[in-house]
């Protein structure tokens, strides 16, 4: 079988949620050595990087000026050691926002709730869309997707107090062009039916997988490299729509 | 057809009590909101009770002294309210699956015509 150096890790420095006209930037992370990185959207070739030098740093960073729908698909990237090419990367989805209009965003029975409500979200855009949105900050990755004519709901279900946080929503012209995000909806969820005063959120933290972590090499990160960059491989998990 | 009437409202001296009364009817709903607005106010938030189940849910600033109850029977929901203060005078609303917007107030299809509580010290 045809060999081939282990995958790169595809990330987007910041967000993968890019809003019109901003520059998107994406990182592709290899290997020290690398003489070039390739970045494909929706299978076909967009750009390529050759770092320099190869051997001082394990990854480049592919900036996408001028985000539009155009340029909001399936990006994948690969490297080359030599003549030896990597397989290809998991597959990151950049989206442009900011399309449009501005939904929105309600919850029922209200923003203050106890521990075992149901809770339910509602998006709401009056402008033709069907496809519907709903993340929470911090947690960018899990999306929720509902379906409606100009309002989706979200059903929540009992609430726990690991629901607490801030929440968005955004309409979908397709799964790559989103609307403007809706101001958020901020949920407190108190302990328990019978105590109801209010508890602070749990603080959120900007997700680790949207941060680009390219290193200069030192003497000892050489050694390190190829373990360091299987287990990411290993242990990254991607999202998909 | 549904419509929601609120009844009850009337003048008392500060420390007397009252009883709301918000009469639900055309269809079967979730929740029943019960909200105010003091002249030159914002609308505000006082309690709410899901009609399954008859969990509660107050405001802080009237804890502990206004009680929200359903008689499912009849398709009511009471507020009672005791050791009234001057600062609880207000026209209260009763609104069915009132739900809190982005835009910062609680939108909901169905609302009440309010009925007037007026607190003398």
């Known amino acids: 079988p045809k060999q081939t150096l282990p995958k790169p890790i595809i990330r987007a420095e910041s967000t993968y949620m890019v809003p019109k006209e901003k520059q998107a930037t994406l990182c592709c992370q290899g290997s020290y050595g690398a003489v070039e990185y390739q970045l494909h959207f929706e299978g076909s070739l967009f750009a390529v990087e050759r770092p320099k030098p190869p051997e001082r740093i394990n990854g480049v960073k592919f900036h996408i000026p001028d985000m539009n729908s155009r340029k909001a698909g399936r990006y994948s990237c690969i490297y080359r050691v030599g003549e030896l090419w990597s397989e290809r990367s998991d597959l990151l989805d950049l989206v442009v926002t900011e399309m449009y209009d501005t939904p929105t965003l309600s919850v029922h029975p209200g923003p203050e709730v106890t521990s075992g409500e149901k809770v339910t979200f509602y998006c709401r855009l009056d402008t033709a869309t069907s496809m519907f949105l709903l993340l929470k900050e911090g947690r960018s990755r899990d999306v929720q997707r509902s379906y409606g004519k100009v309002q989706a709901e979200f059903p929540m279900g009992p609430v726990t107090t690991a629901h607490r946080g801030s929440y968005r929503c955004f309409g979908s012209y397709n799964n790559y062009a989103w609307s403007f995000p809706s101001e958020p909806v901020k949920l407190l969820v108190t302990g328990d039916i019978e105590n109801t005063s209010l508890a602070p959120t749990d603080p959120t933290f900007p997700d680790s997988w949207d941060t680009c972590l390219l290193t200069r090499e030192t003497g000892l990160q050489k050694d390190l490299a190829l373990w360091d960059h299987t287990a990411q491989n290993h242990h990254h998990h991607h999202h998909h729509h | 057809q549904v419509q929601l009437v609120e009844s009850g409202g009337g003048m008392v001296q500060a420390g007397g009590s009252l009883r709301l009364s918000c009469a639900a009817s055309?269809?079967?709903?979730?929740?029943i909101h019960w909200f105010r607005q003091a002249p030159g106010k914002e609308r505000e938030f006082v309690a709410r009770?899901?009609?399954?189940?008859?969990?509660?849910f107050y405001a802080d600033s009237v804890k502990g002294r206004f009680t929200i109850s359903r008689d499912n029977t009849e398709n009511l929901v009471y507020l009672q309210m005791n050791s009234l203060k001057p600062e609880d005078t207000a026209v209260y609303y009763c609104?069915?699956?009132?739900?809190?917007?982005?835009?910062?107030?609680?939108?909901?299809?169905?609302w009440g015509p309010g009925t007037q509580v007026t607190v003398s010290s």
């Open positions: 055309g269809r079967t709903f979730n929740t």
């Open positions: 009770i899901w009609w399954i189940g008859g969990a509660t």
């Open positions: 609104a069915a699956d009132a739900r809190y917007t982005s835009h910062g107030y609680y939108e909901s299809d169905y």
